[in-house]
């Protein structure tokens, strides 16, 4: 892979360990955690960045769902298995065998269970709803100028082809960026847009996950856009199955 | 409008030091994001580093991390690159650059040609004992 070869590291994923040991004396790179061959020309998968962040401190957060079959990850971080691609696989059990079924971006669909709960396939994620809440600026953002800056970033930062990148909404102070991708749209060497979005959250949390390369400073127009709240709402291609004890909660 | 222009070039022996200076005028230099690129004769201009607005988040290639420095005094309108150890390959025509777009800040954007508007004529630097 194009990893940098003066001094062999990773630039998508500061979290591996790089070596030039592959073919010809190649710099590889291996995800932290899992120890799996990453490619370093695009980003890593969730699942690898998760497992390789699974000490850090546990993110919880409630939120307010847009639809009925939206997920947001109240669960938080968790240590993931993810298959030999580095997707996440279907079923997830924690040390004490509790297990639950989860979508293309590792978050729960299904209520918790046994050992005997069945997770037949990964249902995908098509559609991600990033939320955004930017600190009050002196006037609002021009519309125009915020969606070509926010696409922009996400062709170039994150190399996700801006067919989907569906639609950038704002009205002061809420930006909404709706990435809509399905499993027929997305063809071979095609950034995820899970994945994509996940980048992006860490970014905004000044939690950059790109080696060397830098923070994030997001301005339109020369204002600064300094964003104060994130949630995130993922919509899975066949709804979610939570008992209605979870749903009237 | 903004006119750039680069000084500080010249004749160095490997691992001596320079500083190149490039002098900005025309726009409110403070709200510019800029950036060093380089040519060498017989190859394609490119990045050399790159520095945001408030002049945090130096970006640099990796041919010249730990011997470059990037850094900007807005009071005087003016963008600096301190080269230390230098080498034979860095010999080039050094070119300043910036970007008025007002846009965000990050490594794929800052290096990045097409990123910037406005280019100085740039400052030659060879490096040979």
């Known amino acids: 892979h194009t990893a940098a070869q003066d001094n062999c590291t990773c630039p998508t994923n500061k979290m591996t360990v790089c070596s030039p040991d592959g073919p010809g004396g190649r710099c590889q790179c291996r995800a932290l955690g899992s120890g799996m061959a990453v490619d370093c020309s695009t980003l890593t998968s969730k699942c690898l960045l998760l497992k390789a962040r699974m000490s850090a401190p546990k993110n919880a957060r409630t939120l307010v769902r847009p639809s009925e079959h939206a997920l947001v990850d109240n669960d938080g971080l968790y240590d993931p298995d993810c298959d030999p691609e580095g997707r996440f696989k279907a079923r997830q059990c924690n040390q004490t065998s509790v297990c639950w079924c989860v979508n293309s971006v590792g978050v729960r669909r299904t209520d918790k269970g046994d050992l005997s709960l069945r997770c037949d396939e990964l249902v995908r994620t098509h559609h991600i709803l990033i939320d955004l809440r930017h600190r009050p600026t002196a006037g609002a953002f021009n519309h125009s100028d915020l969606d070509a800056e926010l696409r922009r970033l996400f062709r170039e930062r994150y190399r996700l082809h801006p067919k989907f990148v569906a639609a950038v909404h704002y009205e002061q102070p809420t930006i909404q960026i709706e990435l809509r991708q399905n499993t027929s749209q997305k063809a071979a060497g095609d950034v995820d847009i899970g994945d994509a979005a996940y980048y992006f959250e860490r970014d905004i949390k000044g939690e950059s996950l790109f080696q060397g390369r830098g923070g994030l400073d997001l301005r339109v127009r020369g204002e600064p856009l300094q964003v104060e709240r994130t949630l995130i709402y993922y919509l899975d291609e066949i709804p979610p199955k939570f008992s209605m004890k979870r749903l009237t909660a | 409008q903004v006119q750039l222009l680069e000084s500080g070039g010249g004749l160095v022996q490997p691992g001596g030091s320079l500083r190149l200076s490039c002098a900005a005028s025309g726009r409110t230099f403070s709200s510019q994001s800029m950036g060093w690129f380089r040519q060498a004769p017989g190859k394609e201009r490119e990045f050399v580093s790159a520095?945001?607005?408030?002049?945090?988040?130096?970006t640099y290639a990796d041919s010249v991390k730990g011997r470059f420095t990037i850094s900007r005094d807005n009071s005087k309108n003016t963008l600096y690159l301190q080269m230390n150890s230098l080498r034979a390959e860095d010999t080039a025509v050094y070119y300043c650059?910036?970007?008025?777009?007002?846009?965000?800040?990050?490594?794929?954007?800052?290096?990045?040609?097409?990123?910037?508007?406005?280019w100085g004529q740039g400052t030659l630097v060879t490096v040979s004992s």
């Open positions: 520095i945001s607005w408030t002049g945090a988040n130096p």
């Open positions: 650059a910036a970007d008025t777009s007002g846009g965000s800040y990050y490594y794929e954007r800052a290096t990045a040609e097409t990123s910037y508007d406005y």
